[in-house]
């Protein structure tokens, strides 16, 4: 008789999760030779230890500490790109602008990007059927706690001008409940960060509105200003052209507004 298993509202652990994390770690250390000292088996063991045999609604940042101490690396603090609800474009951007970094360009972010995982209390099994949904089940689930922990430290590292890419097609361009709004904004260090520059990405080709005047952007400006960090905002009306101009800045069409 199969043992009763808790049914959660979210999708289960990504298939072949252990193999995927290990393979990504190996690939990352190959792409980044300066990280070749990283022991990927130790990384996986620490990752696994954070959630295996633990109730998936009772995960804490403490659980991830053995993983958090691994993979020390160098990210220029003035080349950090944060993003909210527009991950794909942010990643396309850093793939072209190789000297800028999103969290997913770092080892720990790269390992976990787009993956889901959870275990079960008192068993060493990984739950491939379902995992807790942040809204419907609980916020202290393995995936949410992981991203909260790594995002906080990434934001703490930033200096000078920090950029954030925001999705202008969303009803809340700046969402206080996003990882950016609830974690990263509050962990920028005012003594190191001079300016937060928001890039609001437009969705429609004919959309010529100044989305920097959006009430949620004004809310972001208020939060940032209260933290003694300057705020600036730019509309990116044509994201396709924006990327093209990052690739080919000498192009004559790149002098006009994008």
């Amino acid at each position: 008789v199969p043992r009763w298993r808790q049914q959660w509202s979210g999708p289960g652990t990504t298939k072949r999760f252990p193999e995927t994390v290990l393979a990504r770690c190996v690939k990352y250390t190959e792409i980044h030779p300066e990280m070749r000292h990283v022991d990927c088996q130790s990384v996986w063991d620490a990752f696994k230890g954070a959630f295996i045999s633990k109730h998936p609604c009772n995960i804490t940042e403490e659980d991830y500490q053995p993983l958090m101490k691994l993979g020390t690396q160098t990210v220029p603090c003035n080349k950090i790109l944060l993003w909210s609800r527009i991950k794909d474009l942010a990643h396309q951007f850093t793939q072209v602008q190789r000297d800028m970094f999103t969290l997913e360009d770092t080892l720990l972010g790269y390992l976990a990007d787009d993956l889901t995982w959870c275990g079960e209390f008192n068993t060493s099994k990984i739950n491939y059927q379902s995992c807790p949904d942040w809204r419907k089940d609980c916020s202290n689930n393995p995936v949410s706690v992981f991203w909260k922990t790594v995002s906080r430290r990434f934001a703490e590292a930033a200096c000078d001008v920090v950029h954030v890419m925001l999705n202008g097609s969303r009803s809340k361009i700046f969402d206080k409940n996003s990882t950016f709004g609830s974690v990263e904004v509050h962990n920028l260090q005012p003594e190191k960060v001079q300016t937060l520059e928001a890039w609001v990405i437009h969705g429609g080709r004919e959309d010529s509105r100044d989305l920097c005047q959006d009430p949620t952007i004004k809310e972001l400006e208020s939060i940032i200003s209260k933290r003694n960090i300057q705020f600036s905002c730019k509309n990116i009306y044509r994201p396709d052209k924006f990327l093209q101009c990052v690739k080919n800045p000498e192009d004559s069409s790149c002098t006009s507004e994008i």
Epitope: E61, E62, T72, V75
Partner: antibody, heavy 120, light 108 residues
Framework: QVQLVQSGAEVKKPGASVKVSCKAS????????MQWVRQAPGQGLEWMGA????????TYNQKFKGRVTLTADKSTSTVYMELSSLRSEDTAVYYC?????????????WGQGTLVTVSS | DIQMTQSPSSLSASVGDRVTITCTAS???????LHWYQQKPGKAPKLWMY???NLASGVPSRFSGSGSGTDYTLTISSLQPEDFATYYC?????????FGQGTKVEIK
């Protein structure tokens, strides 16, 4: 604002022990290694050891052969460095310093230093 | 253990001079993990440059760093009065950590 505040100067006799504290604030205490570095008068920097408050992991400079003990109190965000069997050559300024995870392990914040004088 | 040797141990220079400090490792070091600190008398060291060439927050752009393998340099393009200090190179490794012996930059 990140701050590391160390305890005050100490004068000790040879053979005694000293315990120096370093209280951290303004960042997530658990997720950064804390290093201890000392500097004898007119000399360079010498690494003593490191502690990771998140899980209590510790690494020591073998030179100190069990004389140094590092501990962390997560409830007060404080790390401690105890050095035993003091000798005159342990007279130095002792620094705690945070290891920057995204700074390639560089020490991005330092305490103000604690002068320990060993004299009979 | 990898040793870090700085040269010169001290140097005298005038305001406006270009100054170069060298740090040589006894075996190869990843450029991502080679750092520099500035220390003034009676003060704690300050992170000055990390990952060979990245300036720490607030460090003036007249400072630059370069190098790979075993040889690294810190350069001040035009020495200013506030730059007179001792500079230490440092190689990150879990254990043991090693610092250079320091280079004292003095006023000529």
């Amino acid at each position: 604002q990140v701050q590391l505040v160390q305890s005050g100067a100490e004068v000790k006799k040879p053979g005694a022990s000293v315990k120096v504290s370093c209280k951290a604030s303004g960042y997530t205490f658990n997720t950064y290694w804390m290093q201890w570095v000392r500097q004898a008068p007119g000399q360079g920097l010498e690494w003593m050891g490191a502690i990771y408050p998140g899980d209590g992991d510790i690494t020591y400079n073998q030179k100190f052969k069990g004389r140094v003990t590092l501990t962390a109190d997560k409830s007060t965000s404080t790390v401690y460095m105890e050095l035993s069997s003091l000798r005159s050559e342990d007279t130095a300024v002792y620094y705690c310093a945070r290891e920057g995870y995204y700074y390639g392990g560089a020490l991005d914040y330092w305490g103000q230093g604690t002068l320990v004088t060993v004299s009979s | 253990d990898i040793q870090m040797t700085q040269s010169p141990s001290s140097l005298s220079a005038s305001v406006g001079d270009r100054v170069t400090i060298t740090c040589t490792a006894s075996s190869s070091v990843s450029s991502s993990y080679l750092h520099w600190y500035q220390q003034k008398p009676g003060k704690a060291p300050k992170l000055w440059m990390y990952g060979t060439s990245n300036l720490a927050s607030g460090v003036p752009s007249r400072f630059s760093g370069s190098g790979s393998g075993t040889d690294y340099t810190l350069t001040i393009s035009s020495l200013q009065p506030e730059d007179f200090a001792t500079y230490y190179c440092h190689r990150y490794h879990r254990s043991p950590w090693t610092f250079g012996q320091g280079t004292k930059v003095e006023i000529k």
